[in-house]
């Protein structure tokens, strides 16, 4: 493993065997709203006197409070096996990220290998078209951007319930409208392997020139 083994300075402690978290699943891929469980485990020989509890971290920040984690201890003649279980019910996009376990053993911090949770779902809009007032027969642009995972996300433009582009464009997409003679409603459809999300419809109004 790429984890740091404890390094302690006294002569006796130099004889201690290295301790590291056991290997576990690395990259978990699942759909939004599913449940997920994963764990870290470590074997601590009896020769180690000082150990602290296992803490969970996500993207560099410690997970405190409401997260559902359980630590189980299994002692035997040689030491103790510790398993830290972590579960997330109905995962959301915000659960995406790198999870690590940390533990102090003989005053040395040990860090587990990462568990990367990838939550896949329908495309999510980060930029939708916005309503504008335009001059009659004057070109204007509309922008649509949606993300996964999964990628790629493909965009279709819709004007008054009819698709504008026959072939989809990769997100982000800019639609250049050459000009309008009357009010129209535009929206965009974002497609990925999980399905389709439709943006809000925006009214493009024609400015009345006094």
């Amino acid at each position: 493993a790429h984890t740091a083994a404890p390094q302690v300075t006294s002569t006796a402690s130099k004889l201690l065997p290295p301790v590291a978290f056991n290997h576990t699943i690395g990259h978990i891929v699942l759909s939004e709203h599913k449940n997920v469980k994963f764990n870290c485990s470590i074997n601590i020989p009896n020769t180690y006197q000082e150990t602290a509890g296992i803490s969970w971290w996500k993207d560099g920040k410690e997970l405190l409070g409401a997260h559902h984690s359980i630590t189980q201890f299994y002692p035997d003649e040689e030491g103790v096996s510790i398993i830290a279980l972590f579960s997330i019910a109905s995962v959301q996009r915000s659960d995406n990220g790198s999870y690590f376990c940390k533990m102090k053993v003989n005053n040395r911090e040990i860090v587990s290998d990462p568990i990367y949770v990838e939550v896949q779902g329908l495309p999510y809009f980060i930029k939708q078209p916005e309503s504008v007032n335009v001059t009659r027969n004057t070109a204007f642009n509309l922008t649509c951007q949606a993300v996964g995972p999964p990628e790629p996300v493909n965009i279709f433009w819709v004007q008054n319930s009819s698709r504008v582009n026959e072939k989809p464009e990769r997100s982000p997409s800019v639609l250049t409208v050459p000009g309008l003679t009357e009010t129209a409603v535009f929206s965009c459809e974002a497609h990925n392997d999980k399905g389709l999300t439709v943006s809000k419809g925006v009214h493009i109004n024609i400015k009345v020139i006094p």
Epitope: A1, H23, G26, H27, G60, S98, V111, D113, E151
Partner: antibody, heavy 122, light 111 residues
């Protein structure tokens, strides 16, 4: 979303060379961007990566020989400090698979540029 | 550094046949492994990530498996369009660094 490399040309050994990766539709504050090269008729060789936070990581063989830096919101440079004939290759830039403002992540490559050819010769 | 060893260097099979490519990591990388396809004059295209998950638009004829240090890419019902070079890539990382490395590549010839 697209990437395009530029700056590849013929230079003599020891002449520093800077390649630029220009991205379109990609937020470099959310995605990591890596550099990979391929010598003529050879396999892919990972050089290094710059994370969304701006932290750089290099393959051991590449440390000190290459420098990756974000030069704008749409460009990332790869500087070859003292090229030798062994550095003759097509250089690709590629976008990491996942968004997120983090220094570390699972950086396999989802979108690649077409590559730019660098020739180091006397 | 992690070293990825890919075998064989080249393999030939008939249309409709099956090829198997192996990739071995010098140390455990869990399932942080991707497979790419590259055709001459083109950049690589990701086929599989997390050792076994198909990337978008990739036919189910491509199958990845393995964990730890041993990984396999299997291409069944071979088509002429599958003639290409295939690469594995470790994308393992830790809380302090990343360990990216490519295998040496396997040329697939379809006859």
């Amino acid at each position: 979303q697209s990437l395009e490399e530029s700056g590849g040309r013929l230079v003599t050994p020891g002449t520093p060379l800077t390649l630029t990766c220009t991205v379109s539709g990609i937020d470099l504050s959310s995605y990591a961007l890596g550099w990979v090269r391929q010598a003529p008729g050879k396999g892919l060789e990972y050089i290094g990566i710059i994370s969304s936070t701006g932290t750089t990581y290099y393959a051991t063989w590449a440390k000190g020989r290459f420098t990756i830096s974000k030069t704008s919101s749409t460009t990332v440079d790869l500087k070859i400090t003292g090229p030798t004939t062994e550095d003759t290759a097509t250089y690709f830039c590629a976008r990491g698979a996942y968004a997120g403002y983090v220094a570390f992540g699972p950086y396999y490559f989802h979108i690649w540029g077409p590559g730019t050819l660098v020739t180091i010769s006397l | 550094d992690i070293v990825m060893t890919q075998t064989p260097a080249s393999v030939e099979a008939a249309v409709g046949g099956t090829v198997t490519i192996k990739c071995q990591a010098s140390q455990s990388i869990s399932n942080f492994l991707a497979w790419y396809q590259q055709k001459p004059g083109q950049p690589p295209k990701v086929l599989i990530y997390a050792a076994s998950h198909l990337a978008s638009g990739v036919p189910s004829r491509f199958k990845g498996s393995g964990s730890g240090t041993q990984f396999t890419l299997t291409i069944s019902d071979l088509e002429c369009a599958d003639a290409a070079t295939y690469y594995c890539q470790s994308y393992f990382y830790s809380s302090t660094s990343i360990y990216n490395a490519f295998g040496g590549g396997t040329e697939v010839v379809v006859r």
